[in-house]
């Protein structure tokens, strides 16, 4: 028969014939023969192939660098490499993940839209009339204005999108 | 043609140092395991040492051969090696080549190793 | 160091008996054994590796089986040209890699 040209799914052509490729979590060791289905052995502690493969080698699990900030989110298995997330407080600077910086506080004037994840920065938002941000936070959202009225009390001191309004007593009226 | 070649026995005195190789043709040299084997005279089949497959290959070998064998490849040259050193009588045995670690699916003719004084 | 304990060491057997060869190892090899059969003046050829896969060629009443530690080689009905020395590898694979022979059985003609 001619030797073929094309291999199926999961098969590999060397040599004029298809052998198996390695499946995930194996390497290759040897190449099929006219005797022997390929030669494949799981990868070892600490390392990696998610696919099915051809390699000799297999890759080694991502270290998540507790320097960088870093943690295990996810442990790797023989078929999947470890995910990094970052420390409390920390996001990372990229989709790989392999470095972490500290989460955005949103200004005065600011307020938190969205909470930084281990993966997301912190989104701040301006304070909109009638809300106010007094402080720098990570987790503060804009407050609303005291409703002076609600308390029978007037406003004394108009609201920023920084500060709260004032409100003070009403005027007695005179006899 | 899928081959193997073993060359370089020879007839040696106590304490000698000797180079085998082992000529590879027929199939893909880097993506293959390859292993060394021998058998002393009327004995039985005795596994030397083991590389894998890739430019880096890993090395291993029989305890009583560690620090007196290394196994080694020539990718360009398609060739396997076996230097021995300080070689004893009881190294004197026809050394195999052999493709593969687990299972040994090809094998060379060997070639004789003797070890006298 | 690993070591395969073959049994036995020679067997005598006629054409047509139902042979069959142990392979122990010294520690758990999962199934990462192969079985050769060598005659007189030849490389040893490859039988079953895998503990049970039959190599391509080899005719069927070969079979092996087991895992872990214990294995076995059977010959269904002895022919002629299956007199010879048989022999079982075991390996170990993890952090590091050895590899070792069982001792050989001699088959001989009864």
């Known amino acids: 028969p001619e030797p073929p040209t094309a291999c199926r799914e999961k098969q590999y052509l060397i040599n004029s014939q298809c052998c198996s490729l390695c499946q995930p979590g194996q390497k290759l060791v040897s190449d099929c023969t006219e005797f022997t289905e390929t030669e494949c052995l799981p990868c070892g502690e600490s390392e990696f192939l998610d696919t099915w493969n051809r390699e000799t080698h297999c890759h080694q699990h991502k270290y998540c660098d507790p320097n960088l900030g870093l943690r295990v989110q996810q442990k790797g298995t023989s078929e999947t490499d470890t995910i990094c997330t970052c420390e409390e407080g920390w996001h990372c600077t990229s989709e790989a993940c392999e470095s972490c910086v500290l989460h955005r506080s949103c200004s005065p004037g600011f307020g938190v839209k969205q909470i930084a994840t281990g993966v997301s920065d912190t989104i701040c938002e301006p304070c909109p009339v009638g809300f106010f941000s007094n402080v720098s936070s990570a987790f503060e959202k804009c407050h609303p204005w005291t409703s002076c009225e609600t308390k029978d009390l007037v406003v004394q001191q108009a609201g920023t999108n920084k500060t709260d309004v004032v409100c003070g007593p009403q005027d007695r009226l005179r006899a | 043609e899928v081959q193997l070649e073993e060359s370089g026995g020879d007839l040696v005195q106590p304490g000698a140092s000797l180079r085998l190789s082992c000529a590879v043709s027929g199939f893909d040299f880097s993506s293959n395991a390859m292993s060394w084997v021998r058998q002393a005279p009327g004995k039985g089949l005795e596994w030397v040492s083991s590389?894998?497959?890739?430019?880096?290959?890993?090395?291993y070998y029989a305890s009583w051969a560690k620090g007196r064998f290394t196994i080694s490849k020539d990718a360009s040259k398609t060739t396997l090696y076996l230097q021995m050193n300080s070689l004893r009588a009881e190294d004197t045995a026809t050394y195999f080549c052999?493709?593969?670690?687990?299972?040994?699916?090809?094998w060379g003719q060997g070639t004789l190793v003797t070890v006298s004084s | 160091d690993i070591v395969m304990t073959q049994s036995p060491s020679s067997l005598s057997a006629s054409v047509g008996d139902r042979v069959t060869i142990t392979c122990q190892a010294s520690q758990s090899i999962s199934s990462y054994l192969a079985w050769y059969q060598q005659k007189p003046g030849q490389a040893p050829k490859l039988l079953i590796y895998d503990a049970s896969t039959l190599a391509s060629g080899v005719p069927s009443r070969f079979s092996g089986s087991g895992s872990g530690t214990d294995f076995t080689l059977t010959i269904s009905s002895l022919q002629p040209e299956d007199f010879a020395t048989y022999y079982c590898q075991g390996t170990v694979y993890g952090s590091s890699t050895i590899s070792a022979f069982g001792q050989g059985t001699k088959v001989v003609i009864k």
């Open positions: 590389i894998y497959a890739g430019s880096s290959g890993s090395t």
């Open positions: 052999a493709r593969g670690v687990t299972r040994l699916p090809l």
